[in-house]
């Protein structure tokens, strides 16, 4: 699978994707904020 995440539990896999999505959203917001402040 694409990013090397490995888990035997499907629910754990979904949780990992949710965390990844959350982090992407937070980091994306921070990046936009930094660009705005420049």
């Amino acid at each position: 699978h694409s990013d090397g995440i490995f888990t035997d539990s499907y629910s754990r896999y979904r949780k990992q994707m949710a965390v990844k999505k959350y982090l992407a959203a937070v980091l994306g917001k921070r990046y936009k904020q930094r660009v705005k402040n420049k």
Epitope: H1, S2, D3, I5, T7, D8, S9, Y10, S11, R12, Y13, R14, K15, M17, K20, K21, A24
Partner: antibody, heavy 117, light 112 residues
Framework: EVQLVQSGAEVKKPGSSVKVSCKAS????????MHWVRQAPGQGLEWMGL????????RYAQKFQGRVTITADESTSTAYMELSSLRSEDTAVYYC??????????WGQGTLVTVSS | DIVMTQSPDSLAVSLGERATINCKSS???????????LNWLQQKPGQPPKRLIY???TRESGVPDRFSGSGSGTDFTLTISSLQAEDVAVYYC?????????FGGGTKVEIK
């Protein structure tokens, strides 16, 4: 209401590849877990793999590892399943299905792939 | 892989009578999140499968209440309390707890 519409039936030669599409409407495609399941004639169901379109993250059944590729095009809300090195045993109806609550809530109508020389 | 064993393979029941299908998994399907990802599907000839039951006992909306799911751990049951003509189909259990996701072999329900 989520709807999944799959591409039409295919007849393929042994050793070739097939690519089946599944177009989703009425839901958030990118944030869905899209699975592929197949059913050989008169047989049971077999899970092939999944894709999470936001990250294009895939997970494949061991049996199909190296032979199946699942992709997604977020711009058209379409998932694809490509199976290579086809053999007669791959003759089956191929379904896409979307997960909700850890279970397949929505299914495509199925695509019959016939492998014959 | 988790092996899902369904019994019986086929079942003939009189209209209005109870139909019981069993499903056994080779490993517990209780997940670390407290849920049991055991599902039941109904498939009629020439149609895609349809979700009936998920989380072992939660009925899909719109599914008649004559269908019920029960069980925990490794042993599960689908019960049709009063068989109707439109219930003639193949029923599959499948587990969504562990990769690879796996299905039972199916139970064909017919009218006696």
């Amino acid at each position: 209401e989520v709807q999944l519409v799959q591409s039409g039936a295919e007849v393929k030669k042994p050793g070739s590849s097939v690519k089946v599409s599944c177009k989703a409407s009425g839901g958030t495609f990118s944030d869905s877990y899209m699975h592929w399941v197949r059913q050989a004639p008169g047989q049971g169901l077999e899970w092939m793999g999944l894709i999470y379109p936001i990250f294009a993250d895939t997970r494949y059944a061991q049996k199909f590892q190296g032979r199946v590729t699942i992709t997604a095009d977020e711009s058209t809300s379409t998932a694809y399943m490509e199976l290579s090195s086809l053999r007669s045993e791959d003759t089956a109806v191929y379904y896409c299905a979307i997960d909700q609550d850890g279970s397949f809530a929505y299914w495509g109508q199925g695509t019959l792939v016939t492998v014959s020389s | 892989d988790i092996v899902m064993t369904q019994s019986p393979d086929s079942l003939a029941v009189s209209l209005g009578e109870r139909a019981t299908i069993n499903c056994k998994s080779s490993q517990s399907l209780l997940d670390s999140d407290g849920k049991t990802y055991l599902n039941w599907l109904q498939q009629k000839p020439g149609q895609p499968p349809k979700r009936l039951i998920y989380w072992a006992s939660t009925r899909e909306s719109g599914v008649p209440d004559r269908f019920s799911g029960s069980g925990s751990g490794t042993d599960f049951t689908l019960t049709i309390s009063s068989l109707q003509a439109e219930d003639v189909a193949v029923y599959y259990c499948w587990q969504g707890t562990w990769f690879d996701l796996t299905f039972g072999g199916g139970t064909k329900v017919e009218i006696k």
